[in-house]
């Protein structure tokens, strides 16, 4: 296992619709053809996996159908979007990148993006 640098923004404020996007950039030492990207959430010293996707270079990222994440890749950058966020989802979102193929295997973990989320104000009741 070899180490690899991963960069991501320090802080992002989600939109009022609970959507946050950020770029995860990795310094690829070689020509990887298969890359795995995992988003981890750290809150109160606990780390949980938010979503993960494996993709072939030049192809789209494919997350599971029920995933809250979507993403696109371009070169050594992955543009990640997390949706359906609520205030309780505020936390540090860490980008983990693994170069799976060809060998050698590389692993990089970013410092994390602090995502702040605010619940939208409830709409006042209105009669139609």
């Amino acid at each position: 296992c070899k180490a690899m640098h991963v960069a991501q923004p320090a802080v992002v404020l989600a939109s009022s619709r609970g959507i946050a996007s950020f770029v995860c950039e990795y310094a690829s030492p070689g020509k990887a053809t298969e890359v795995r990207v995992t988003v981890l959430r750290q809150a109160d010293s606990q780390v949980t996996e938010v979503c993960a996707a494996t993709y072939m270079m030049g192809n789209e990222l494919t997350f599971l159908d029920d995933s809250i994440c979507t993403g696109t890749s371009s070169g050594n950058q992955v543009n990640l979007t997390i949706q359906g966020l609520r205030a309780m989802d505020t936390g540090l979102y860490i980008c983990k990148v693994e170069l799976m193929y060809p060998p050698p295997y590389y692993l990089g973990i970013g410092n994390g993006t602090q995502i702040y989320v605010i619940d939208p104000e409830p709409c006042p009741d209105s009669d139609f």
Partner: antibody, heavy 117, light 108 residues
Framework: QVQLVQSGAEVKKPGASVKVSCKAS????????IGWVRQAPGQGLEWMGW????????NYAQKLQGRVTMTTDTSTSTAYMELRSLRSDDTAVYYC??????????WGQGTTVTVSS | EIVMTQSPATLSLSPGERATLSCRAS???????LSWYQQKPGQAPRLLIY???TRATGIPARFSGSGSGTDFTLTISSLQPEDFAVYYC?????????FGPGTKVDIK
């Protein structure tokens, strides 16, 4: 080194608007947020809100909603805070500060805004 | 919003004494999001402690922070002349971020 430099003091009449600038240097501007804090004479610190320089999203304190607008110009690494319909109780020192998640770690020198007829 | 309260409002001590400042949140705050600031007259605030207990760059070891949940403490083990100032706690766990009203540490 990481630095935030604010625009100079302003004197405004009630009902007018003021726009304070905050120029960042020494770090990747879009990786962080810029918060705005004010301090009335002899009073404590009041959080006004902040802007995510990464995407331009903003969050304002409830009491200032509708009167304040925070923006950034990423090409010049500058943040702006505009406060409209000024009142005498808006007289304060206005600070910008870098938001990083886990405290605001770098502060501007402050801009004195005086509202007087 | 989370309301932060600080006590005492004023603390009168002599150089060399230990100062204990308290900060309480109206609801539980993750310790990762609790900070302390020092402000001297005519100056901008300065970050002292973040994550409830981690000293910011260049902050002397006499400053320490502790606590969790709703109760947090800033301790200055032995007051130096330059430590007489106003101290604020702040949470950035929930939006909007909020400050406490401050504790003034003055010379007895």
């Amino acid at each position: 080194q990481v630095q935030l430099v604010q625009s100079g003091a302003e004197v405004k009449k009630p009902g007018a608007s003021v726009k304070v600038s905050c120029k960042a240097s020494g770090y990747t501007f879009t990786s962080y947020g810029i918060g705005w804090v004010r301090q009335a004479p002899g009073q404590g610190l009041e959080w006004m809100g902040w802007i995510s320089a990464y995407n331009g999203n903003t969050n304002y304190a409830q009491k200032l909603q509708g009167r304040v607008t925070m923006t950034t110009d990423t090409s010049t690494s500058t943040a702006y805070m505009e406060l409209r319909s000024l009142r005498s109780d808006d007289t304060a020192v206005y600070y910008c500060a870098r938001v990083r998640g886990g405290g605001v770690d770098v502060w501007g020198q402050g801009t004195t805004v005086t509202v007087s007829s | 919003e989370i309301v932060m309260t600080q006590s005492p409002a004023t603390l009168s001590l002599s150089p060399g004494e230990r100062a204990t400042l308290s900060c309480r949140a109206s609801q539980s705050v993750s310790s990762s999001y609790l900070s302390w600031y020092q402000q001297k007259p005519g100056q901008a605030p300065r970050l002292l402690i973040y994550g409830a207990s981690t000293r910011a760059t260049g902050i002397p070891a006499r400053f320490s922070g502790s606590g969790s949940g709703t109760d947090f403490t800033l301790t200055i083990s032995s007051l130096q002349p330059e430590d007489f100032a106003v101290y604020y706690c702040q949470q950035d766990y929930n939006l909007p971020f909020t400050f406490g009203p401050g504790t003034k540490v003055d010379i007895k």
